[in-house]
């Protein structure tokens, strides 16, 4: 039975050209996290954090994605096209797969809202394959 929940940074905003930290946290389960996959709104993979093998940043994002902090991901040099949904997929044993969602809004530099600002609505979501 899956007892865990994923807590994420929820809906966040950041300025164009700035950076933002995408963060998820799995709680309420003793399951072992074997891998965390970070995915973008168009279903492309940004990065994989394998518990033993470390980080793999996808080639298309190597210039502007940095691993961490922790199991999170730092997205740099933001463009307006980065606006949208991001997903963290936790592969765990023995529970299976949990998934969390973050919505990032990238704001024009002249507008309000700092990097990582804009009201952090903690969002709980879990999903099993």
């Amino acid at each position: 039975m899956m007892t865990g929940t994923i807590e994420t940074t929820g809906n966040i905003s950041a300025k164009k050209g700035g950076s933002v930290i995408l963060q998820c946290h799995l709680s309420s389960t003793m399951a072992q996290v074997t891998q965390v996959n970070w995915e973008q709104h168009d279903h492309s993979l940004l990065a994989i954090r394998n518990a033993e093998l470390g980080w793999h940043i996808y080639p298309a994002f190597k210039d502007r994605v940095a691993p961490g902090p922790g199991l999170g991901l730092t997205l740099q040099s933001l463009t307006m096209n980065d606006t949208g949904e991001y997903f963290c997929t936790y592969h765990t044993y023995p529970d299976g797969t949990y998934r969390g969602r973050i919505f990032l809004e990238v704001l024009e530099s002249s507008g309000g809202g700092g990097a990582g600002g804009g009201g952090h609505h903690h969002h709980h979501h879990h999903h099993h394959h």
Partner: antibody, heavy 121, light 107 residues
Amino acid sequence: QVQLQESGPGLVKPSGTLSLTCAVSGYSITSGYSWHWVRQPPGKGLEWIGYVHYSGSTNYNPSLKSRVTISVDKSKNQFSLKLSSVTAADTAVYYCARMDYGNYGGAMDYWGQGTLVTVSS
Amino acid sequence: DIQMTQSPSSLSASVGDRVTITCKASQDVRTAVAWYQQKPGKAPKLLIYSASYRYTGVPSRFSGSGSGTDFTFTISSLQPEDIATYYCQQYYSTQWTFGGGTKLEIK
């Protein structure tokens, strides 16, 4: 240039233990990467068996986990595979391979030439 | 486990032909797919990783595309030295799995 070379008995008796070694040259296996075993039954596809990470941790295919041990011999710069309680279904060409996870994800970029192991009495 | 189903299992083509091999994953694997070439009696060689990126030294006639569950491997102009069996592999999950292979022959 990294090179991998498998060695070990080509014939193993049913219920016995298959033991293979992969000698690595051109790179110290305790310096980085993960080191894998993959097998290919005659005329069939590839099956991942498991790996040993340079740190010493291991991970195995769940379907084989109860029978597999992969270990490292630092002094000889080699890693080994032991597969117990073998049957004819374990007859295959066994490959060792390297995975550069940081650059290529779960793709294996260097392979040994493979060694055929037949399980027969 | 995630199953990778390749098609066709074998195909025959002429030198200069455009050749396409497909691989279907049993669940969404995003772009965590690699392609290998294996010549008879030899070890597999990595050609493509992350679905569409050519490995170092791989000729430009080899390409990969796709995301989610459907992936394509293409040889734009078949050369005699391309005769081999080609395999896809997924690494989205922590248990890596390969397709059954596509054997490519010259007409």
